[in-house]
Interface confidence: medium
């Protein structure tokens, strides 16, 4: 004779207040004949949740039609879940008995617990920008989840990070929990377009983790490189000098020209271009009038990037006698 098995597949069922919980129970045999009842808890104080033979259970419905003789599914749904519904639920097979039906076999039980989804992770970067090769910290926070078990991972451009510390609070029993994690990220020069992702996995999310992101563009400062060059061709009695500011981020930039230490306001033209890695190039042209110049003209291109200390590059202008003559000739 086959032994009847009561199968309750879920050890833990997480439910949300106000929703409907489905408690699964199937049997492997219909013999001995008798009803299946649902209880919360064990022992003499257990609470009857559902009896297929009799009683009124307004919040409970059956998944299958229990009046069908071949039914082996005794799963139930409990509607409008409240915190008072938490506990361990047992489906129990009774055999016909007297003076009452006799308990024959119980399922292993399903613990119903209130589950709360974590809030969307919020990722905050450093307050100030930092240059490449340095380490910056990012924090990720998520709140309001239950139960306490939760998994948090960090990624940079899809690659998992390992240098982080995570805390879940409180440490004891609570209705809901919070997680805070701090990751240390070494900045690379090309990180303007990079992202850090905080990924939170929780049983209530059914395998669909929540993600919070931060752009490293908010945390990185790529300082510019400067190059000042004199163009070989002249325009009339003027020489074109170019200041190329390369590979900087963010875009915030102030450029000034000085002629022998005197700040000039006459920048001729400039162009801003964006590189593939998200950094910028700035080119500024400065026309120097050489008709009456001495030989010792020094031009300085000074750049103040993102509120940092100014950097500059100097160029001693080379003006040949031939150029001077040509200049003189061109003067009206």
């Amino acid at each position: 004779e086959e032994e009847l098995q009561m199968i309750q597949p879920e050890k833990l069922l997480l439910v949300t207040v106000g929703k409907t919980a489905t408690l699964h129970c199937t049997v492997t045999s219909l013999l001995p004949v008798g009803p299946v009842l649902w209880f919360r808890g064990v022992g003499p104080g257990r609470e009857l949740i559902y009896n297929q033979k009799e009683g009124h259970f307004p919040r409970v419905t059956t998944v299958s039609d229990l009046t069908k003789r071949n039914n082996m599914d005794f799963s139930i749904r409990i509607s409008s879940i409240t915190p008072a519904d938490v506990g361990t639920y047992y489906c129990v097979k009774f055999r016909k008995g007297s003076p009452d039906d006799v308990e024959f076999k119980s399922g292993p039980g399903t613990e119903m617990a209130l589950g709360a989804k974590p809030s969307a992770p919020v990722v905050l970067g450093p307050a100030a920008r930092t240059t490449p090769e340095h380490t910056v910290s990012f924090t990720c926070e998520s709140h309001g989840f239950s139960p306490r078990d939760i998994t948090l991972k960090w990624f940079k451009n899809g690659n998992e990070l390992s240098d982080f510390q995570t805390n879940v609070d409180p440490t004891g029993q609570s209705v809901a929990y919070s997680i805070r994690s701090t990751a240390r990220v070494v900045l690379d020069p090309w990180d303007v377009r990079s992202q850090v992702i905080c990924e939170v996995a929780h049983v209530t999310l059914q395998g669909d983790p929540l993600r919070g992101t931060a752009n490293l563009s908010e945390a990185i400062r790529v300082p510019p490189t400067l190059e000042v060059t004199q163009q070989p061709m002249r325009v009339g009695n003027q020489v074109n000098v170019t200041c190329q500011v390369r590979k900087f981020y963010p875009q915030s930039l102030q450029l000034t020209w000085s002629e022998n230490g005197n700040v000039c306001q006459r920048e001729t033209a400039s162009t801003l271009t964006e590189n593939k890695d998200g950094t910028y190039n700035w080119t500024s042209w400065f026309l120097v009038n050489i008709s009456d110049q001495r030989d010792d003209v020094v031009l300085t291109c000074q750049v103040k990037h993102d509120g940092q200390l100014a950097v500059s590059k100097r160029l001693a202008l080379e003006v040949t006698v031939h150029q001077k003559d040509q200049s003189s000739d061109a003067t009206p």
């Epitope: 004779e1 492997t28 004949v33 071949n70 055999r95 003076p99």
Partner: antibody, heavy 118, light 107 residues
Framework: EVQLVESGGGLVQPGGSLRLSCAAS????????MHWVRQATGKGLEWVSV???????YYPGSVKGRFTISRENAKNSLYLQMNSLRVGDTAVYYC????????????WGQGTMVTVSS | DIQMTQSPSSLSASIGDKVTITCRAS??????LAWFQQKPGKAPKSLIY???SLQSGVPSKFSGSGSGTDFTLTISSLQPEDFATYYC?????????FGQGTKLEIK
């Protein structure tokens, strides 16, 4: 019409074997527990075995280990394989349907006679 | 095993009579009791289940009562077709067992 028809009875020597069949019609056979009940001539009724919807089986001590109940839902058929037969197994064998949720018999076949004699 | 005892073993009655057959279980069987009618050379016919529930198609002159160990079958107004042997059966636990039968004869 709901109907059960037994067959396969006959005369067999002690120690011999016999297989009874019960053909069901007019209802969804696979949805019911099925029983065999026997009645010796001039005597009362004796329950012989049950097979549940899932194929689980029970027997009284008098036939346990000698009789095997089985079912073939695709053929709407119930069987009773009787081995090591004894003179005391002589009886009319009825198949019956466990009809209500609590397995009370509601439909009976007309019976088939099994005689065990040397 | 649960023993089922019927009384009387036989009973003579006239057409139109009201008769009562009793069945006693050797232990409490709740209300898991059935009654059957059997005529000579025929298969048993189901009359009552769960002590008092009438099987479909059974006339209301048949009624059952009782719970625990003592049960009764009452036939309110005997007709010729009611003369037969009546069996009670417990089906609370395996092996299911029957009473020895009550033979109802015409007086």
């Amino acid at each position: 019409e709901v109907q059960l028809v037994e067959s396969g009875g006959g005369l067999v020597q002690p120690g011999g074997s016999l297989r009874l069949s019960c053909a069901a019609s007019g209802f969804t056979f696979s949805s019911y527990d099925m029983h065999w009940v026997r009645q010796a001539t001039g005597k009362g009724l004796e329950w012989v075995s049950v097979i549940g919807i899932a194929g689980d089986t029970y027997y009284p001590g008098s036939v346990k280990g000698r009789f095997t109940i089985s079912r073939e839902n695709a053929k709407n058929s119930l069987y009773l394989q009787m081995n090591s037969l004894r003179v005391g197994d002589t009886a009319v064998y009825y198949c019956a349907r466990g009809g209500s949720w609590d397995d009370a018999f509601d439909i009976w076949g007309q019976g088939t006679m099994v005689t065990v004699s040397s | 095993d649960i023993q089922m005892t019927q009384s009387p073993s036989s009973l003579s009655a006239s057409i139109g009579d009201k008769v009562t057959i009793t069945c006693r279980a050797s232990q409490d069987i709740n209300n898991y009791l059935a009654w059957f009618q059997q005529k000579p050379g025929k298969a048993p016919k189901s009359l009552i289940y769960t002590a008092s529930s009438l099987q479909s198609g059974v006339p209301s002159k048949f009624s059952g009562s009782g719970s625990g160990t003592d049960f009764t079958l009452t036939i309110s107004s005997l007709q010729p077709e009611d003369f037969a042997t009546y069996y009670c059966q417990q089906y609370v636990s395996y092996p299911y067992t029957f009473g020895q039968g009550t033979k109802l004869e015409i007086k």
